[in-house]
Amino acid sequence: VPKVTFTVEKGSNEKHLAVLVKYEGDTMAEVELREHGSDEWVAMTKGEGGVWTFDSEEPLQGPFNFRFLTEKGMKNVFDDVVPEKYTIGATYAPEE
């Protein structure tokens, strides 16, 4: 699996999550989020520069799981990548 990283961007708060998703040699086509304890995947919105955002009416519950499709057709899923108590500007990589 090529290296993937998730950077929590400025402006993220309890009801807004903005994540820069980088995938070695490829570009994200779709990114989805699943909150801790949730059964449902929800689509994130693509912004500028590879930043993906999600807005919620209720406080978001971490740690956060992500799955994605890339422009080259790669599909992957990562559990608990971004912790509940994340740091703005921090870059998180899936544990190996």
């Epitope: 449902e40 992957n76 899923v77 899936p94």
Partner: antibody, heavy 114, light 105 residues
Framework: LESGPGLVKPSQTLSLTCTVS??????????WSWIRQPPGKGLEWIGY???????YYNPSLKSRVTMSVDTSKNHFSLRLSSVTAADTAVYYC??????????WGQGTLVTVSS | ELTQSPSSVSASVGDRVTITCRAS??????LAWYQHQPGKAPKLLIY???SLQSGVPSRFSGSGYGTDFSLTISSLQFEDSATYYC?????????FGQGTKVEIK
């Protein structure tokens, strides 16, 4: 590749192991799943385990299912307790990318009978 | 819940065959199709409703969004005799349709 007893007695525990080849479970990016198909019926997704040990079990089986993973042996396992004849099925292990089940084992028939 | 129709279909080599899958609630485009032949492992054909999995013949195609989806085999071949299943990946637990058996006349 699934392995385990083909015959289990009612009320006992069904145990299966899936050994992964051609890649490391530890590298992440996938859910390691179990699916079953009772004779003459459709496919039922049992649940998944992630390399970290995170699990999700189908609510219909949750009270009886336990999954585990051993990254050092590159395998993952399924335990289903208190089995009945209704648990007789072909059991498949599969790799999931979060959207699909993109690689499946050949499946193993487990019969529950005394 | 996913409902497939028809439950079985018999067609001739070269025929166009279409199978439908209806979701009880909207699942966006998170639907996959599998081919399952007796004694073999199920094989992924289509993901994200319409994307062809690598290595799958181009006679297979998928379409749909929300609640209504279809799988089409544009020109049926002998080796396409199998049971076909749809599967949703919108939310857990991931579920399958009941299957459609395709037979060659």
């Amino acid at each position: 590749l699934e392995s385990g007893p083909g015959l289990v007695k009612p009320s006992q525990t069904l145990s299966l192991t899936c050994t992964v080849s051609g890649g490391s479970i530890r590298s992440g990016g996938y859910y390691w799943s179990w699916i079953r198909q009772p004779p003459g019926k459709g496919l039922e997704w049992i649940g998944y385990i992630y390399h970290s040990g995170n699990t999700y079990y189908n609510p219909s089986l949750k009270s009886r299912v336990t999954m585990s993973v051993d990254t050092s042996k590159n395998h993952f396992s399924l335990r289903l307790s208190s089995v009945t004849a209704a648990d007789t099925a072909v059991y498949y292990c599969a790799r999931s990318d979060g959207y699909t089940l993109d690689n499946w084992g050949q499946g193993t028939l487990v019969t529950v009978s005394s | 819940e996913l409902t497939q129709s028809p439950s079985s279909v018999s067609a001739s080599v070269g025929d166009r065959v279409t199978i439908t899958c209806r979701a009880s609630q909207g699942i966006s485009s998170w639907l996959a199709w599998y081919q399952h032949q007796p004694g073999k492992a199920p094989k992924l054909l289509i993901y994200s409703a319409s994307s062809l999995q690598s290595g799958v013949p181009s006679r297979f195609s998928g379409s749909g969004y929300g609640t209504d989806f279809s799988l089409t085999i544009s020109s049926l071949q002998f080796e396409d005799s199998a049971t076909y299943y749809c599967q949703q990946a919108n939310s857990f637990p991931y579920t399958f349709g009941q299957g459609t058996k395709v037979e060659i006349k």
